[in-house]
Amino acid sequence: TTTEVVMENVTAFWEEGFGELFEKAKQNNNNRKTSNGDDSLFFSNFSLLGTPVLKDINFKIERGQLLAVAGSTGAGKTSLLMMIMGELEPSEGKIKHSGRISFCPQFSWIMPGTIKENIIFGVSYDEYRYRSVIKACQLEEDISKFPEKDNTVLGEGGITLSGGQRARISLARAVYKDADLYLLDSPFGYLDVLTEKEIFESCVCKLMANKTRILVTSKMEHLKKADKILILHEGSSYFYGTFSELQNLQPDFSSKLMG
């Protein structure tokens, strides 16, 4: 099944340490998640206690859609994803979604092990899926250059990767996992403009075309391709709608996008 995501009037605060919030969210998740028969994820009037990191956020994504989330540094983009994952709990509002989530963090990481292990560890191996992901994340050429190919060991005593290679492996790990909802938090770090454009097309737009995706991005090209756009500014929803609706806005919104 694919998923739909809804957030209604969601507000959230960073009042306590992250760990305490994480524990609270797990124990108290009746506030966070409501059963949703039609497999949807939605945010409704979502906020937290103290100074809100998110205030009155609303959006809805249909199954298979791409939501682009933009905003300057500190606007609340990562916090939004954390709420969907249950690592941050709303003080008010509703988030609805169901199914499995796969998350690609902003800062990519590599586990000690082979390239292949880094992508498929803990997930059943499917040759066709694996090859498709490797190709879409532009890892084929990198892998072909290593004598041991994808059995090349990374980490201690192994190969040291560039930031761009790390980012692509991290994305491949998230995409290879079969999930209903993919949360991609600025996944193209360290990539040059051309590579980013190609991977966005081949991976996010084509390979994942039927999946529900939330992409944190500041790139205009990504916004154009998204089904819906949410621009956050200081924790609030500055804009929510389609790209054509965004174009009709008179004020200059670029300062809200770039961080």
Partner: nanobody
Framework: QVQLQESGGGLVQPGGSLRLSCAAS????????MGWYRQAPGKQREPVAI???????RYAEPVKGRFTISRDNAQNKVYLQMNSLKPEDTAVYYC???????????WGQGTQVTVSS
């Protein structure tokens, strides 16, 4: 720098259970992932279970359904509950943590787990 301290290893009979604990101290504000690796005599160190940001937990095939990884983020601890232990689970178990923007790995000293009757 990050320091890791494991505990909970020991000798257990086949079918028995153990719970390993690992406490992280130091620069633990930017943890990307935590987990457990093991190294059996004469073999390479291999991943057993990993918990990363977003609550993603993954397990090696031989331990699925028997081992459970959990985290206490407030105290920077990671646990490995090992049930239905088999002789082939005998190994030194290492706590592993990946942190920082440049993906730095830190390891514990290891704790011995022996499954034998």
């Amino acid at each position: 720098q990050v320091q890791l301290q494991e505990s909970g290893g020991g000798l257990v009979q086949p079918g028995g259970s153990l719970r390993l604990s690992c406490a992280a101290s130091g620069s633990t504000s930017s943890i990307n992932a935590m987990g457990w690796y093991r190294q059996a005599p004469g073999k390479q160190r291999e991943p057993v279970a990993i918990s990363s940001s977003g609550g993603d937990t993954r397990y090696a095939e031989p331990v699925k359904g028997r081992f459970t990884i959990s985290r206490d983020n407030a105290q920077n601890k990671v646990y490995l509950q090992m049930n239905s232990l088999k002789p082939e689970d005998t190994a030194v178990y290492y706590c592993w943590l990946n942190w920082g923007r440049t993906s730095v790995n830190s390891w514990g000293q290891g704790t011995q787990v022996t499954v034998s009757s």
